[in-house]
């Protein structure tokens, strides 16, 4: 059967993003419509046809355009994605003979981790704090020279869609840690980044 090939995309917040649909058919469509999937009913964004060219709905005027003007291959581009743009989008190819053939491409917005790593001595113990804020939620791990060191983790979701993960390493005998390196590892979207801290007695 005739089908539409799409690919999901993941792009960084406040950067451009493109979604593409390809009609696997001998014939071009008569008109292509892009819609955003919503809970109740899809919202029309933009259409392209030979008769009328590109017609962008007012709500999307300064947000998107069709950057591949095809009736078999169609690409929409968001100039500067925000968290509100995350979601799934439908491309509908209205074809002669076979009606509306649709595909769905989903856009995921990510925010690169912002990491802070610091330590604090207090009386007989040392606390090393590693905090990572990102979207989707990052994971925080520790690499320390010896085992048996306790840590506690707190997760906080922010209204802007990012999540902060804060992990505190509790070291009971801080003298043994002076001059040694502690590594906070942040895992985000499959990539692990090391953040190193050498403890100095202040």
């Amino acid at each position: 059967q005739v089908q539409v090939v799409t690919q999901d995309e993941r792009e960084q917040l406040y950067t451009p993003a493109s979604l593409k649909c390809s009609l696997q058919n001998a014939q071009e469509a008569l008109i292509v419509t892009w819609q955003k999937k919503k809970a109740v009913s899809p919202e029309n964004m933009v259409t392209f046809s030979e008769n009328h060219g590109v017609v962008i709905q007012p709500a999307y005027k300064d947000k998107i355009n069709i950057t591949q003007l095809g009736l078999q291959n169609s690409t929409i581009t968001f100039w500067n994605i925000t968290l509100e743009d995350e979601g799934c989008y439908m491309c509908l190819f209205n074809t002669f003979g076979f009606g509306k053939i649709s595909g769905t491409a989903c856009l995921t917005v990510y925010v690169q981790p912002i990491v802070s790593l610091h330590y604090k001595f207090s009386e007989d113990h040392l606390n090393i704090t590693c905090s990572a804020t990102a979207r989707p939620a990052p994971m925080v791990f520790w690499k320390v020279p010896r085992s048996g060191i306790e840590n506690s983790t707190v997760t906080l979701s922010h209204p802007n869609g990012t999540t902060s993960v804060t992990s505190i390493l509790h070291i009971k005998d801080p003298k043994n840690q002076v001059g040694k390196e502690v590594i906070c590892q942040v895992l985000h979207l499959g990539t692990v980044t090391d953040f190193k801290q050498t403890v100095n007695k202040g």
Epitope: V2, A26, Q27, G97, G99
Partner: antibody, heavy 117, light 107 residues
């Protein structure tokens, strides 16, 4: 040059089936939809269905309640329209045509199918 | 199914006349309408597609207009070879349906 050549006239008894062929030449067969329309004596044209030879996807007029089947043989550049459970009202001239999207340009010469007991 | 109604069903005209045939759809069909000419014993011939686009090789005296539910085929100056039956076809929604035809005769 582009040609659509249909099979010859047929006389069938009620309840029988008929299979009409439409042989295409002069162009790439899979690039155009093949459509079938018919015209009973003194009646308007009637769209029966069509096939996209590229995939073999077809679409039928539900009026024919599953009696019509459109197929294609890409190696022979030929489309077929089979109509089963024939009745006298199916007596008509059957035409195949080709279209690129909604642009119809070439037609077969027509095949007269007579259903009579 | 979408019903297509042509008017008039038949009309008599003379060579050189300007002739208008109308086609009305029972619901909005956008611009998805074609016009065909058919002569006795012959296959239909496409004249206009997408309401107003002329098929290659069709004389410019033929023109189409309209969108939504009301459509018109105009022949600006009738020629002897134009006497035939004319059909409209909607292809907005399946099954695609033809009008009943307009027979154009010599007066």
């Amino acid at each position: 040059q582009v040609q659509l050549v249909q099979s010859g006239a047929e006389v069938k008894k009620p309840g029988a089936s008929v299979k009409v062929s439409c042989k295409a030449s002069g162009y790439s067969f899979t690039d155009y939809i093949i459509l079938w329309v018919r015209q009973a004596p003194g009646q308007r044209l009637e769209w029966m269905g069509h096939i996209d030879p590229y995939y073999g996807s077809s679409n039928y007029n539900l009026k024919f309640k599953g009696r019509v089947t459109i197929t294609r043989d890409t190696s022979a550049s030929t489309a077929y329209m089979e109509l089963s459970s024939l009745r006298s009202e199916d007596t008509a001239v059957y035409y195949c045509g080709r279209s690129k999207r909604d642009y119809f340009d070439y037609w077969g010469q027509g095949t007269l199918v007579t259903v009579s007991s | 199914d979408i019903q297509m109604t042509q008017s008039p069903s038949s009309l008599s005209a003379s060579v050189g006349d300007r002739v208008t045939i109308t086609c009305k759809a029972s619901q909005d069909i956008n611009s998805y309408l074609s016009w065909f000419q058919q002569k006795p014993g012959k296959a239909p011939k496409s004249l206009i597609y997408r309401a107003n686009r002329l098929v290659d090789g069709v004389p410019s005296r033929f023109s189409g207009s309209g969108s939504g539910t009301d459509f018109t085929l105009t022949i600006s100056s009738l020629q002897p070879e134009d006497f035939a039956i004319y059909y409209c076809l909607q292809y907005d929604e399946f099954p695609y349906t033809f009008g009943q035809g307009t027979k154009l005769e010599i007066k």
